[in-house]
């Protein structure tokens, strides 16, 4: 014969374990119902009655299955240098990220800290490494036969047109000028632009620690806002 | 104890660069972050930037972005702090202090002059 | 960026009376983490300054008691119960909420 389904609550087997989405409630000693996600326990079982589950109240949640007298509050809103990427439901928390253009600086368990606009590269610098969730742009000085003309967090150093006959030839912050007749592209990198890193939720683990250095720092260690000599600019 | 001990007094011509250093010890350096303030003769308080020592993230005043840069160097538990292109007006008192969340311990203080 | 504005600027007091600094923040100070970040500082003549109050309301370790905070949002006092000598100085309120993180402009303390 198969063994008979027991219906919560009901007593476990000596030394026996109660089943997915139940919990055995010391008082009563008996395993008993969880709360679906969004609920949470109203009142607790008896060794008559089962648990009695009942709907988190605005602005709080339960995100798994639970028997927690109270649901859990949503955090506080989203500073003004976040937007909210998941709202506050019965199920879920907030989640607060940093703004499209900005990079989380500094990382908490509970989120993002601290949110800090990622580094424009000015002309005649392009962005040698670009930004990530947690880590600013790098800039780097355009190479010789390479420019870019833009104030960028986006944009990389491109190749000068090759002329026939050079008008005005090209520098770091500019293209060169042709002659009349049609010009080309010498073959450097294609990539002219690059995207926005797309702002999901914020990670909590820190990024792995860059090499810290003195003053006099080389181009591409990303310790604080790049001199002018390094290419980057503010607003 | 915590303690944070800037480097010395310095006289500079305008258009010249000064870097202050600021040396903890007393606590895991790497774990917290360093703000500088300044504070010119008889003024207030003025924020010029913070960085991570864990990771070098940074960020500065709108106002200094294109002429300070902040380092940090985990081995010797210092940071630094680079003002390029100097006027007359970056005469202050620089201090640099731990934290983000708030700043509990602050170094002593450089008095940097800019005069020709 | 987040203005704080203190009031008063200067503020005459009693040996042995309250003292009371206000400060208000141009936008909320709460963060989404659900602390609010904003400290007071003591400045003493020809010092460093000191933080006496972080989180609004928590005294730093060695601070005396009668150094006391409070506020929410936007609106923050800084309450001193019995002004002792040693309190004359300038007090400021500082936010490390979000970036730039900013200062009042400053209280003077001084004895009548």
């Known amino acids: 014969l198969p063994a008979q389904v027991a219906f919560t609550p009901y007593a476990p087997e000596p030394g026996g374990t109660c089943r997915l989405r139940e919990y055995y409630d010391q008082t009563a000693q008996m395993c008993c119902s969880k709360c679906p996600p969004g609920q949470h326990a109203k009142v607790f079982c008896t060794k008559t009655s089962d648990t009695v589950c009942d709907s988190c109240e605005d602005s709080t949640y339960t995100q798994l299955w639970n028997w927690v007298p109270e649901c859990l509050s949503c955090g506080s809103r989203c500073s003004s240098d976040q937007v909210e990427t998941q709202a506050c439901t019965r199920e879920q928390n907030r989640i607060c990220t940093c703004r499209p253009g900005w990079y989380c600086a500094l990382s908490k368990q509970e989120g993002c800290r601290l949110c800090a606009q990622l580094r424009k590269c000015r002309p005649g610098f392009g962005v040698a490494r670009p930004g990530t969730e947690t880590s600013d742009v790098v800039c780097k000085p355009c190479a010789p036969g390479t420019f870019s003309n833009t104030t960028s967090s986006t944009d990389i150093c491109r190749p000068h047109q090759i002329c026939h006959v050079v008008a005005i030839p090209g520098n770091a912050s500019m293209d060169a000028v042709c002659t009349s007749t049609s010009p080309t592209r010498s073959m450097a990198p294609g990539a002219v632009h690059l995207p926005q890193p797309v702002s999901t939720r914020s990670q909590h683990t820190q990024p792995t620690p860059a090499p810290s250095t003195a003053p006099g720092t080389s181009f591409l260690l990303p310790v604080g806002p790049s001199p002018p000599a390094e290419g980057s600019t503010g607003d | 104890q915590v303690q944070l001990v800037q480097s010395g007094a310095e006289v500079k011509k305008p258009g010249a660069s000064v870097t202050v250093s600021c040396k903890a010890s007393?606590?895991?350096?790497?774990?917290?972050?360093i703000i500088w303030v300044r504070q010119a003769p008889g003024q207030g308080l003025e924020w010029m930037g913070w960085?991570?020592?864990?990771?070098?993230?940074?960020n500065s005043a709108q106002k200094l972005q294109d002429r300070v840069t902040m380092t940090t160097d985990t081995s010797t538990s210092t940071a630094y702090m680079e003002l390029r292109s100097l006027r007359s007006d970056d005469t202050a008192v620089y201090y640099c202090?731990?934290?983000?969340?708030?700043?509990?311990?602050w170094g002593q203080g450089t008095l940097v002059t800019v005069s020709s | 960026d987040i203005v704080m504005t203190q009031t008063p600027l200067s503020s005459p007091v009693t040996l042995g009376q309250p003292a009371s600094i206000s400060c208000r923040s141009s936008?909320?100070?709460?963060?989404?983490?659900?602390?609010?970040?904003l400290s007071w500082l003591q400045q003493r003549p020809g010092q460093p300054p000191r933080l006496l109050i972080y989180?609004?309301?928590s005294r730093f370790s060695g601070v005396p008691d009668r150094f006391s905070g409070s506020g929410a949002g936007t609106d923050f006092t800084l309450k001193i119960s019995r002004v002792e000598a040693e309190d004359v100085g300038v007090y400021y309120c500082?936010?490390?909420?979000?970036?730039?993180?900013?200062f009042g402009r400053g209280t003077k303390l001084e004895i009548k």
């Open positions: 936008q909320s100070l709460v963060h989404s983490d659900g602390n609010t970040y």
């Open positions: 202090a731990r934290g983000e969340d708030f700043f509990d311990y």
């Open positions: 960085i991570s020592a864990f990771n070098g993230n940074a």
């Open positions: 989180k609004v309301s």
């Open positions: 500082t936010q490390s909420t979000q970036f730039p993180f900013t």
């Open positions: 007393g606590y895991t350096f790497s774990t917290y972050g």
